[in-house]
Every structure is written in C-alpha cells, then in structure tokens.
C-alpha cells in the first residue's frame, strides 16, 4: 500500500481467483484513543473499533472511503483504491490502446516546436467518476522539472455504438534548451482513477521524436504566363521555432483532386515556394517536416486550384 | 575551415556535407524510430557519446558570439562517431548488409571532421569507451542505438552549419 495523495491510498493486488489479497492497517488521524468506530462509504455498519482497523483487501467491495468517527463526529477519512496486477501485468482498463505508433500506446504526445512545450492525449470510453493527474520530468534518476497543467476533456467522438472521450494535457519543460541535442528523455506519468480503480500510464520520449509542425501558413497562388504552371508560395507556421535559418523545415507540395486515387503532381522543396501544375477541381496542398530530423509531417494546408 | 584559434569554417561546404550526413544517418537505419530502444537499458551504452549540450554555444546566439566552442564540440562528436562506425560494433558479426549506407556515413563523418580541422591542427578528442558487446544480438542493438544517437547529433550539427552559412558566411 502507498499514498497517492493526502488520505488516498493505493492497494496493489495480485488479481486471480481466490487470491489472498492484502492485509491493510488503517490508522485514524486523531489524538483520541478511545470510543473510535469505523465505517465504509455511506454505510452505517460499524466495521470495527479502536484507533486502527485491520482489513483484508481482496476485491473492489473492500475498497472505498473508510471513515473513523467518535460520538457522531467524523475524525478522518482514508480512501482505498485498488491497482490490479494480472499475470504480472498491471491492468490498463481505463484507457484505450491507440495502437499508434505501436501496440500498447495509451499516451500520445506531440510538440509543435523545440521550445520544450508539448501536449499529450489519451482516450477512454468512460464518461463518469474519472480523474487524471499528470506528472512529468526530464530524466528519471536525477529528474529536471517539467510543469504540466490539469488534464481536460478535449474531444468527444462517437465510435460505433459507444462514445469515446479524449483527454489532453499541456506540459512545459522548466529550463528548455531548444538548440541542444537531448540526451535524457522526457518522462510523462498519468495517474488514472475510475471509481475505486487506480491505474498508471507512462510514456518516455525525446522532444525531437514527437515534433509535428503546424501546417504552413498563408498559401498563395500565382499563375505563370503562357503555362499550365502555378507558383505556390507559403510561410513557416507561427508556432515553429526561430530563427528559421537554424530551425529549418522542408516541404512537400502536392496537387490532387478530391479522391486519393486521382492523379497528382508532387514536389519536395526546402524553399517556401514551388511551381506545380494546377488542374480544375484540384487543390494544392503543402505540408512541412523538420529538415534535418525525420519526425512527423505536419497536416496539409490547402487552397483550391481555381 | 575552422582552425583552432579562430578562422571561419567553409560554412556552405559544411552545410552541404552535414545535410548529406542527415540523409545518410536516416537511410542507414530508417526504421530505428519504430523501435523503442530506451526500453533496452540505454544508459550504459549511449550515455558515453558526446552530446551537444546547452552550454556548448551551438545555439544561434552562441554561434554569433564565438562559433569556435560549438565547432570544437561538433568536431569531437564527428571523430567519436567516425571511430565508433569503424569499430567492431559495425565491422563484426552480424555483417552489415552490403547495401548499408554505413560505409558512406563513415566516410562523410571523416570528411566533415577534416573540413573542420585541417591536418596539423589538433583539438582534443574524447576517449572512445570500450563498448565490445559479446553477443551478435547485443551488437545489433548497440548499432541501432548509436545510429539513433547519431541522427540526433547530425541534426544539430546541420542546423548549426545551415545557420552559419546563412548568417555568418563572409
């Protein structure tokens, strides 16, 4: 058993049929010695008396809010949560496996630049009685500070018969060094509590590996005289690291109709303009990627050919 | 050429060669990103490689103030990786695929380090740790980790030279 936060404790249980469970001793936080009784949740049934209560925790029915009283007055609470371990593996029932970029990916994180700011998100089908707490650091043995905000519900989607909820959190490295080569990864730890179930999820990454620039901005077209060609120009996204002579992007420019199966014109460039062939009912799209490190491409920025 | 004591390197040449290094480092192991190498006890194997750190003057401001600190750091790293790529980690079993770009990568690391430091001038170089894995699978894993680390190192070097070519070239 360990303390998650004040008056909240996590009991780690090997979860299999007829498992013996864990013996837990609860102590009432009071100077009083006599006349103390214990109850669980809303029940008025007295579970025991005395300053300490010993219980055998085997299942969710044994978890919950234990309260010690004296003469009708509440002295203190202890909330017990369960963390299940099945076949040596901690349960991952609360969050959905996003399966990208690999199986058992519960947390996904992205950064728009090298400033040390990043966003992580996760998915669940659970809609109520759900809380998350996020901690992060750079490195684990001698951790350097990363400050994370509160996790918030950022999107709701209908997937087949059930709803899916996306939560996200923003974090910022306290002393970021955008130009340096990272040697220690960022660690992100998410505590998830659903009713009386506790689970924790972790992710470890370098900012450079989660970079995904915003799409290029201000796409403009200029038809070339006596030609089917069009000069398309754009600018670096506002959120990208500066100066651009140092933090350079490379771009992919594509002309395509509405269907992915349609023919296309495609060209790669390090410049912020390119000449392409525009077709009626097609769109010109441009996306960006770090020029020197193959992290994710941005989403496409598009303008119609016409 | 970056001569110890102060003259400027051939920024544009260094830019072109460092960008080539980036391309080669990724083609040497493009799928390395799909492997979570940190799960494999990263600390003792690649913590010894020279990293371009915050105080090394490789940021735009540091380059403007005095690029020599940064260039020396890059030079150390290039020599370090060049030696690693020539060591039995890469030459031993399992043999590299004949079409592996590691040979080109090795040559390009040497080429860029020579651009930065002509013969007769010597910056101190970092000692190569004795990383001699006994098992072929350990060697394979170590190659992945070294190449992964090299990708990050050459990306920073390429940024430095691109910025230098754009803003510091005579």
């Amino acid at each position: 058993i360990w303390e998650l936060k004040k008056d909240v404790y996590v009991v780690e249980l090997d979860w299999y049929p007829d498992a013996p469970g864990e013996m837990v001793v609860l102590t009432c936080d009071t100077p009083e010695e006599d006349g103390i009784t214990w109850t669980l949740d809303q029940s008025s049934e007295v579970l025991g008396s005395g300053k300490t209560l010993t219980i055998q925790v085997k299942e969710f029915g044994d978890a919950g809010q234990y309260t010690c009283h004296k003469g009708g007055e509440v002295l203190s609470h202890s909330l017990l949560l369960l963390h299940k371990k099945e076949d040596g593996i901690w349960s991952t029932d609360i969050l959905k496996d996003q399966k990208e970029p690999k199986n058992k990916t519960f947390l996904r994180c992205e950064a728009k630049n090298y400033s040390g700011r990043f966003t992580c998100w996760w998915l669940t089908t659970i809609s109520t009685d759900l809380t998350f707490s996020v901690k992060s650091s750079r490195g684990s043995s001698d951790p350097q500070g990363v400050t994370c905000g509160a996790a918030t519900l950022s999107a709701e989607r209908v997937r087949g018969d059930n709803k899916e909820y996306e939560y996200s959190v923003e974090c910022q490295e306290d002393s970021a060094c955008p130009a340096a080569e990272e040697s220690l990864p960022i660690e992100v730890m998410v505590d998830a509590v659903h009713k009386l179930k506790y689970e924790n999820y972790t992710s470890s990454f370098f900012i450079r590996d989660i970079i995904k620039p915003d799409p290029p901005k201000n796409l403009q077209l200029k038809p070339l005289k006596n030609s089917r060609q069009v000069e398309v120009s754009w600018e670096y996204p506002d959120t990208w690291s500066t100066p651009h002579s140092y933090f350079s992007l490379t771009f992919c420019v594509q002309v395509q109709g509405k269907s992915k199966r349609e023919k296309k014109d495609r060209v790669f460039t390090d410049k912020t303009s390119a000449t392409v062939i525009c077709r009626k009912n097609a769109s010109i799209s441009v996306r960006a990627q770090d020029r020197y490190y193959s992290s994710s491409w941005s989403e496409w920025a598009s303008v119609p050919c016409s | 050429r970056a001569v110890p004591g102060g003259s400027s390197p051939a920024w544009t040449q260094c830019q072109q060669l460092s960008q080539k290094l980036c391309t080669l480092a990724w083609s040497a192991h493009p799928l390395v990103g799909h492997m979570d190498l940190r799960e494999e006890g990263d600390e003792e194997t690649t913590n010894d490689v020279p990293h371009i750190q915050c105080g090394d003057g490789c940021d735009p401001q540091g380059l403007r103030d005095n690029s020599q600190f940064c260039l020396q750091r890059i030079h150390q790293g290039l020599i370090f990786y060049e030696k690693l790529l020539g060591s039995d980690i890469f030459t031993g079993e399992p043999s590299l695929l004949p079409d592996s770009p590691v040979g080109q990568l090795h040559a390009s690391l040497l080429g860029l380090s020579q651009l930065l430091q002509p013969e007769g001038h010597h910056w101190e170089t970092q000692q190569i740790p004795s990383l001699s894995p006994s098992q072929p699978w350990q060697r394979l894993l170590l190659r992945f980790k070294i190449l992964r680390s090299l990708q990050a190192f050459v990306a920073v070097a390429a940024r430095v030279f691109a910025h230098g070519a754009a803003t510091l070239s005579p």
Epitope: Q229, T250, E262, K263, D265, F268, I277, R279 | S27
Partner: antibody
Framework: QVQLVQSGAEVKKPGASVKVSCKAS????????LHWVRQAPGRGLEWMGW????????ESAPKFQGRVTMTTDTSTSTAYMELRSLRSDDTAVYYC???????????WGQGTMVTVSS | EIVMTQSPATLSVSPGERATLSCRAS??????LHWYQQKPGQAPRLLIY???QSTSGIPARFSGSGSGTEFTLTISSLQSEDFAVYYC?????????FGGGTKVEIK
C-alpha cells in the same frame, strides 16, 4: 495490368511530320498522365512533354515547343504525338509512358523507332 | 534547365559485387530524383522514386539515397540480370531532365 502499345516503326524524309500512337489498356485512360520521351541511337533519354487526357492540357520541353503536338482520343484510349519539320537528329526511339504522378515515369510503351533520312 | 551528371559513364563490376552509381544535379533538387534501369532493346523501367522510395516488385538489392545535389543508387550484390544502363531523372522543375546514364558491365 496497365499496358501501353505503340505504333510501328516509321521512316521519314527531312521536313516531313510523323505521328506516333500509343494505345492504353488496363486502367481508366483519364486517370493517368501521359508523357513522351525519346532516345536517339546510343544516346540518353530526353523528355518531350506531357498531356493530361482528362482535359487535354499539355506542356512540352522548350526544345520542342512549336514543333510537337500531343493529343488524346479518350474514346479509344489512345495518345498521339506528332513531331513536325523533322531533321536527321530526330532519329530516335520514341516512348510513351503513363503514371498517376506527373513528374516521373512508371509504365512505358515498347517504343517506336522513327528514322529521318533523305 | 537543370543539368544531371552521372558518374562513372561505365562501371565494370563482377557478379556478386556491390555497385555504387552517382548522380549530381546542377542545383539543389531536394529529393526530386528518380532512377531507371534500361536493358538493350527494352524500354526503361522505374526502380526508385523520390531518391529512396522503392518501386513495388523491384528487388531489395536496389536502394537509393541522397538529397540536394548528390544522389546514389546502390546495387548491393549484382546479379547477371542487373547488367544494364541506369539513368537518373530530376523532377524538381520542368523541363524534366535525365542524366547521361551509367552503363554497368560485367568485369
């Protein structure tokens, strides 16, 4: 599968014109760009131009502008390349090729030998 | 127009050996570079597109790398059917241009 079959060899006199055909099969004709590339005997490849069969748009290399006409007949899935004012250095194998991507050449015809000789 | 230069013009290699073919552009073309193989009496066939992407059905012994102005086609272990002429082609800008070719012949 995608296939391009070209017309047979031609012998022409200097100053004449030649029209080479290229019949496509195995795909929807308007879904691919069509290019013409030529190769003089013992020489390298030279791009001449492209046509979009969907709308008839064309673009040709500056070297051939005013001398080459590329057309298509969607009813027969056939592309044509006409080269006028032939000279002896136009002697070459002329290839048509098709691709969904405009700027490189995936599927090639077997080639048509055009000999310009007096 | 962009001029593409291939080297060497002829490469003599023994079967089973590795062949490295170079292609240089007269200006930076990012990764807009494609490789073709042509055997005598046949049309060319696409091997590699956008510098390093392998065309389906092409043996894994063919690989491409490079960006900017310098590109390489590597054939890791030459088979008898690989002796041919290889062309690079830039697609950075029109007119599309080819290199002069590298003939890979049996040593």
């Amino acid at each position: 599968q995608v296939q391009l079959v070209q017309s047979g060899a031609e012998v022409k006199k200097p100053g004449a014109s030649v029209k080479v055909s290229c019949k496509a099969s195995g795909y929807t004709f308007t879904d691919y760009y069509l290019h013409w590339v030529r190769q003089a005997p013992g020489r390298g490849l030279e791009w001449m131009g492209w046509i979009d069969p969907e709308n008839g748009d064309t673009e040709s290399a500056p070297k051939f502008q005013g001398r080459v006409t590329m057309t298509t007949d969607t009813s027969t899935s056939t592309a044509y390349m006409e080269l006028r004012s032939l000279r002896s250095d136009d002697t070459a194998v002329y290839y048509c090729n098709a691709n969904k991507e405009l700027r490189y050449f995936d599927v090639w015809g077997q080639g048509t030998m055009v000999t310009v000789s007096s | 127009e962009i001029v593409m230069t291939q080297s060497p013009a002829t490469l003599s290699v023994s079967p089973g050996e590795r062949a490295t073919l170079s292609c240089r552009a007269s200006q930076s073309i990012s990764i807009n570079l494609h490789w073709y193989q042509q055997k005598p009496g046949q049309a060319p066939r696409l091997l590699i597109y956008f510098a390093s992407q392998s065309t389906s059905g092409i043996p894994a012994r063919f690989s491409g790398s490079g960006s900017g102005t310098e590109f390489t086609l590597t054939i890791s272990s030459l088979q008898s059917e690989d002796f041919a002429v290889y062309y690079c082609q830039q697609s950075n800008s029109f007119p599309l241009t080819f290199g002069g070719g590298t003939k890979v012949e049996i040593k």
